[in-house]
Each structure stands twice: as C-alpha cells, then as structure tokens.
C-alpha cells in the first residue's frame, strides 16, 4: 500500500532524488527571476550591484566539465544557506520599500528553505558529509541607507539567480554521470 501519508518517499534511485532537486531549483529560479524583474520595475537599478557578504559564483562554463557530485552539492548548500541569510536580512532590515514585496520575499524564503531541506536529504541518501566547509560568516550589518538596501536587494536577487541558473545546469549534467 506504500508509505503512510506525510512520510518521506524512500528512494533507492539517486537520480530520482536529483530530479526532484532540479525541479525545486528550477521553480526557485523562476521565482527569483520574477522577483528580480519586479524589483527592477519598482526600483530601477542603475548598473550592476554587488555585496561583499555574498558568496562568489561557484560554477562557470569552464568548470562544468570537472564537476563532482559531492563538491557541487556541498558548495550549493553552503551558498544557498548564505542567500537564505541575506533574504531573511532583507525582510527584517530592508526598510518600508521592501515591505511592499513582503509576500514575494516570504514565498522566496520558504522555497529556499524547502530546497535546502531537499539538498540535505539528497546528501544523506548519497552518504555525503553534511558538515559545511568552514568559512567565516560575515555578520550582516544594518543598511547604510534605504537606497543602499534597495541596491543590496538587487545584488542578492541577481546573485541568487545566477547561482540557481548554474545549479540547474550542474545538477542536470551530474545526473547523466550517475
């Protein structure tokens, strides 16, 4: 009759688990793209925005060929945890302007948390170490100004978009190697 309702599906096929992770990543990518577009429309960005506390992009066209599943999943999880911290920070510290995007930011945070749980599950199924590599957590201080928090929001959503875009490509490529 199958597992009771609400219990996680036990899968012996890591590719099915990877498929599920790809699906969630794609869904989050679409949400991020939509929210980034909303941000640009509501608060037009002048040029590119960066934030020192954001993780550097882990993948590029040059590194796709040498990807290994343990490294990709571990790095992706660490980077997404950083983005989760940044989204939480935006919601709490971003100022009244960003409160107008509160339903969307809240939904984005929930999806991000869901994807992180899925990656954790996938790593445990593949018997990969759960411990994130040691890296200093930069405390996220108050925005210097409202304009600064809007610029930070553009940087966070832009960086998350790029990270998820490469994550989908990387995970799909790794699936073919399983």
């Amino acid at each position: 009759p199958g597992p009771p309702a609400g219990s996680p599906r036990v899968s012996s096929d890591p590719r099915a688990d990877l498929d599920s992770a790809v699906l969630l990543t794609r869904s989050l990518l679409a949400d991020t793209r939509q929210l980034a577009a909303q941000m640009r429309d509501k608060f037009p960005a002048d040029g590119d925005h960066s934030l020192d506390s954001l993780p550097t992009l882990a993948m590029s066209a040059g590194t796709l060929g040498s990807l290994q599943l343990p490294g990709v999943l571990t790095r992706l999880r660490v980077d997404l945890m950083s983005y989760l911290r940044h989204v939480q920070w935006l919601r709490r510290a971003g100022g009244p302007s960003l409160k107008t995007l509160e339903p969307e930011l809240g939904a984005l945070q929930a999806r991000l948390e869901r994807l992180l749980r899925r990656l954790q599950l996938l790593m445990s199924r593949l018997a990969l170490p759960q411990a994130a590599p040691d890296q200093p957590v930069i405390p996220l201080g108050p925005p210097a100004s409202a304009w600064g928090s809007i610029r930070a929001a553009h940087a966070i959503l832009g960086g998350l978009h790029l990270t998820l875009d490469w994550a989908v490509r990387g995970l799909l490529l790794l699936k073919t190697r399983l």
Epitope: K42, F43, R91, R92, A93, G94, G95, P96, S97, K99, T100, E102, G141, P142, P143, A144, S145, A146, W147, G148, S149, I150
Partner: antibody, heavy 117, light 111 residues
C-alpha cells in the same frame, strides 16, 4: 553634520489644513526614507507616516489615513506633511526623522501644531 | 493604548542596574528588529539601541538591548542622574504596515 529642521506649525482651527516642512542637510537626502512622528503634550511617541527614498512608497498610521499626505522634493532636500481635516487630537509636536532601515537615526527638533477653536 | 507594552515607570539609585521591558507580538517584535529611544525632558528623542542590540556611536556601553521571541528589554548599568528620561521601544509591524511604539517608560534616578 546631519540636520533636520521642521517648520510650518502653529495654531489652526478644527477642520482646517496645515502643511509642515522638514529641511534636510548634511547628507544625501535622496538615499533615505523619511518619517513623521508626533507627540501629543505629555504623551508618548506616535508614528504618523513614512515615504521611501525616491517617493514611490508611502505608509500611514490608521489615525491619519485619508487626511494626511506625506511627500518629498529631493531636488530641494525637503520633506512635507500636508494635514487636512485637522482634529483636536492632532495637536502635538511633529518631528521628522531620517531612517536607514526601520530605526530613526536622526530627528528634527520638532514643530508644534495646535488644533483649537 | 500602545501596540508595544512598556511599564510606565522605573527607578533606581546611582550605580544600580535597571531593566525596562517591551512586550509585543509576532507581527512586530517577533519578526522585526527592535529599537530604543531616549528622550530627555524638553528635547527630541535620540536613538539609543537599534537592530535589537546595537549601539550607535556615542552611546555609552552602559546601555544594552536584548530580544527573545516577542519581548525585548533595555538594560542600563551604572545608573547616572543624567539617565533620567523617557525611554521608548519601537519596531515595524507587518500587520499594521507601520512603525509601532511602546507607551514609554519614565526612568527616575533616586537620591
């Protein structure tokens, strides 16, 4: 140094209007959200309204919604509060305040508005 | 009636430590940062603590803020006569879409 100077207060009859101004200097005005906060004589602080750094987002306290309008002119480094249909309970010292996020890091000295017949 | 609840008064003698509480709900203190302001008699309020527990430059480290769940508190150690003032907590409220304040606590330094 950062300076916020309110003006436009005075005595006004119930039902009439008044416009408060807040002249800002010593910082890049167009980078900051700005608020109005008021304090009735002998009472506590009450938030009135906020306007985003470029003027597109505005929020108001329920007690002033539909009667007060917050606006700004970034070219003049000035914040405004247009107060219509004034009531006796609007009598207070009105402060403008600068905010980087949700905390008021600089306040003006305040301007007194008295609504009385 | 204020959305955030503070005791109307508090007192202490010089050198003592006093704590002022601020109670709210999940839509304000529970999900947003808490700030504290000091208002000396006849003057505009001044930022004392922001981001739950950060002090602006120039504020002595005798003042500290903390938060747990839907409550926050301001602690003042080594009380001085010049600390006699009104203290207000505040936070953004997601349900009201605005800033909410506590009713204020009048701190008296005895003796």
């Amino acid at each position: 140094q950062v300076q916020l100077v309110e003006s436009g207060g005075g005595v006004v009859q119930p039902g009439r209007s008044l416009r408060l101004s807040c002249a800002a200097s010593g910082f890049t005005f167009s980078h900051y959200d700005m608020h109005w906060v008021r304090q009735a004589p002998g009472k506590g602080l009450e938030w009135v309204a906020v306007i985003s750094y470029e003027g597109s987002v505005k929020f108001y306290a329920d007690s002033v919604k539909g009667r007060f309008t917050i606006s700004r002119d970034n070219s003049k480094n000035t914040l405004y509060l247009q107060m219509n249909s004034l009531r006796a309970e609007d009598t207070a010292v009105y402060y403008c305040a600068r905010t980087p996020g949700f905390h008021f890091d600089y306040w003006g000295q305040g301007t007194l508005v008295t609504v009385s017949s | 009636q204020s959305v955030l609840t503070q005791p109307p008064s508090a007192s202490g003698t010089p050198g003592q430590r006093v704590t002022i509480s601020c109670s709210g709900s999940s839509s304000n203190i529970g999900s947003n940062y808490v700030n504290w302001y000091q208002q000396l008699p006849g003057t505009a309020p001044k930022l004392l603590i922001y981001y739950d527990d950060l002090r602006p430059s120039g504020v002595p480290d005798r003042f500290s803020g903390s938060k747990s769940g839907t409550s926050a508190s301001l602690a003042i150690s080594g009380l001085r006569s010049e600390d006699e003032a009104d203290y207000y907590c505040s936070a953004w409220d997601d349900s009201l879409s605005g800033v909410v304040f506590g009713g204020g606590t009048k701190l008296t330094v005895l003796g």
